[in-house]
């Protein structure tokens, strides 16, 4: 409607690393003569409309969200209604709505995408000794405490992708971070390098691990 307060937020999701602080940007255009006494600002979880933080009756009513949110009080009068979310957790991921009411009202939703980098993969081999060409080995690539779920790629020493006989499992811990274990079953050649790449799709961060297997030369029993 004509004259309704226009609330603006970023179109793209805000990406925040677990444990860091995130700013959910929100702004409105104050009319001439605007004072904070006229402002009613509500931040809420979009899906449930659960209150996160509010500014009403001319004052900051504080955080209703685990005491981890704050406004920018010095900037409110200029139309900056952004919300600071401290110590971001996986559970914070989702959509937040900025609802502004002055003479009329308007709202807009901004998405928070949480991310955590994966650790450098550790590689284990089973069996890990007396290996000969032709043996079947299991190579496990493990990377820890990332978010969201990873994409895992295997390749050989020549960079050829290995897609068969790969089993990948991802388990979330109590914080919602994922531990990824990817298992490659491969028949050994004379020598071989096997690499695993663990990619965080949000951060576009790749973590690499590799193992080089030197097979024992083939020995034959002496002829009678």
């Amino acid at each position: 409607p004509t004259g309704a307060v226009e609330v603006q937020v970023p179109e793209d999701p805000v990406v925040a690393l677990v444990g860091t602080d995130a700013t959910l940007r929100c702004s409105f255009s104050p009319e001439p003569g605007f004072s904070l006494a006229q402002l009613n600002l509500i931040w809420q979880l979009t899906d449930t409309k659960q209150l996160v933080h509010s500014f009403t009756e001319g004052r900051d009513q504080g955080s209703a969200y685990a005491n981890r949110t704050a406004l920018f009080p010095d900037l409110l009068a200029q139309g900056n209604a952004s919300l600071r979310l401290q110590r971001v957790r996986v559970a914070d991921e989702g959509s937040f709505t900025c609802f502004v009411s002055i003479r009329d009202f308007g709202s807009a939703a901004v998405s928070l995408q949480v991310a955590a980098p994966y650790s450098k993969p550790s590689m284990t081999l089973e069996p890990n000794k007396d290996l000969r060409p032709g043996d079947t080995v299991t190579i496990t690539c493990s990377s820890y405490r990332g978010y969201p779920e990873a994409e895992v790629f295997w390749q050989d020493g020549q960079g050829v992708p290995l897609t068969g006989n790969v089993t990948t499992s991802q388990m979330a811990n109590e914080q919602g971070l994922f531990d990824v274990h990817s298992v490659l079953r491969v028949v050994l050649g004379a020598n071989g390098t096997y690499s695993c790449l663990v990619r965080n799709p949000v951060l576009q961060q790749d973590a690499h691990g590799s193992v080089t297997i030197t097979g024992q030369p083939m020995t034959f029993p002496p002829e009678a």
Epitope: P1, K49, Q50, S95, A109
Partner: antibody
């Protein structure tokens, strides 16, 4: 259980105004949005505007801008919708419906409570 | 102006399952549109069934469920009852206003 009780039927002349009331009883929900919705004979539902009584702020549909005024009296838990310059095509049933700005229960039920409707007939 | 499209009419049988949809001219419906579904029967005031895309209002039978399907808001009635014959309106929130769809007349045969 919250109820919305609306004022009675009205018969009005073209060019005049009508003011319909909507009283909430049986408990309140913080920062509710009281919407006004109308339905002309044989037509669908049409949103006219809404008010947040706690804040005293209202919004209007473009179509009704300048012709409708929505107000609220928090002390009596009553919202009002006044429509001016009435025409015959304003003949309709007018409803108030409560939505929530903040869901204290953590569940957003939407426009879960409706008034019984007020019939407004515009005729010369 | 924002236009919303619903199926004008649908027919189903008692015990069957039917899905009503609501498409927006602005693009895909999201959770921030807070899709509402309202049931209207002749001579009665409208009744809010679903709010916030998929939250059943108190008193709404469990056979009614709301969702987003292929960028549209959807109302599914599983195990349709004869008393479900009515007109169903969707409503979507756009920042500062509600917009209603034209309604779907559901016939039970």
């Amino acid at each position: 259980q919250v109820q919305l009780v609306q004022s009675g039927a009205e018969v009005k002349k073209p060019g005049s105004s009508v003011k319909v009331s909507c009283k909430a009883s049986g408990g309140t929900r913080p920062a509710a949005l009281i919407n006004w919705v109308r339905q002309a004979p044989g037509q669908g539902l049409e949103w006219m505007g809404g008010i947040i009584p706690l804040f005293g702020t209202a919004n209007y549909a473009q179509k009704f801008q300048g012709r409708v005024t929505i107000t609220a009296d928090e002390s009596t838990s009553t919202a009002y919708m006044e429509l001016s310059s009435l025409r015959s095509d304003d003949t309709a049933v007018y409803y108030c419906a409560r939505d929530q700005v903040v869901a204290t229960s953590g569940v957003n039920f939407g426009m879960d409570v409706w008034g019984q409707g007020t019939t407004v007939t515009v005729s010369s | 102006d924002i236009q919303m499209t619903q199926e004008p009419s649908l027919t189903t049988s008692p015990g069957g399952t039917v899905t009503l949809t609501c498409r927006s001219s602005t693009g895909a419906v999201t959770t921030s549109n807070y899709a509402n579904w309202v049931q209207e029967k002749p001579g009665q005031a409208p009744r809010g069934l679903i709010g916030g895309t998929n939250k059943r209002a108190p008193g709404t039978p469990a056979r009614f469920s709301g969702s987003l399907i292929g960028g549209k808001a959807a109302l599914t009635i599983t195990g349709v009852q004869p008393e479900d014959e009515a007109i169903y309106f969707c409503a979507l929130w756009y920042s500062n206003l509600w917009v209603f769809g034209g309604g779907t007349k559901l016939e039970i045969k």
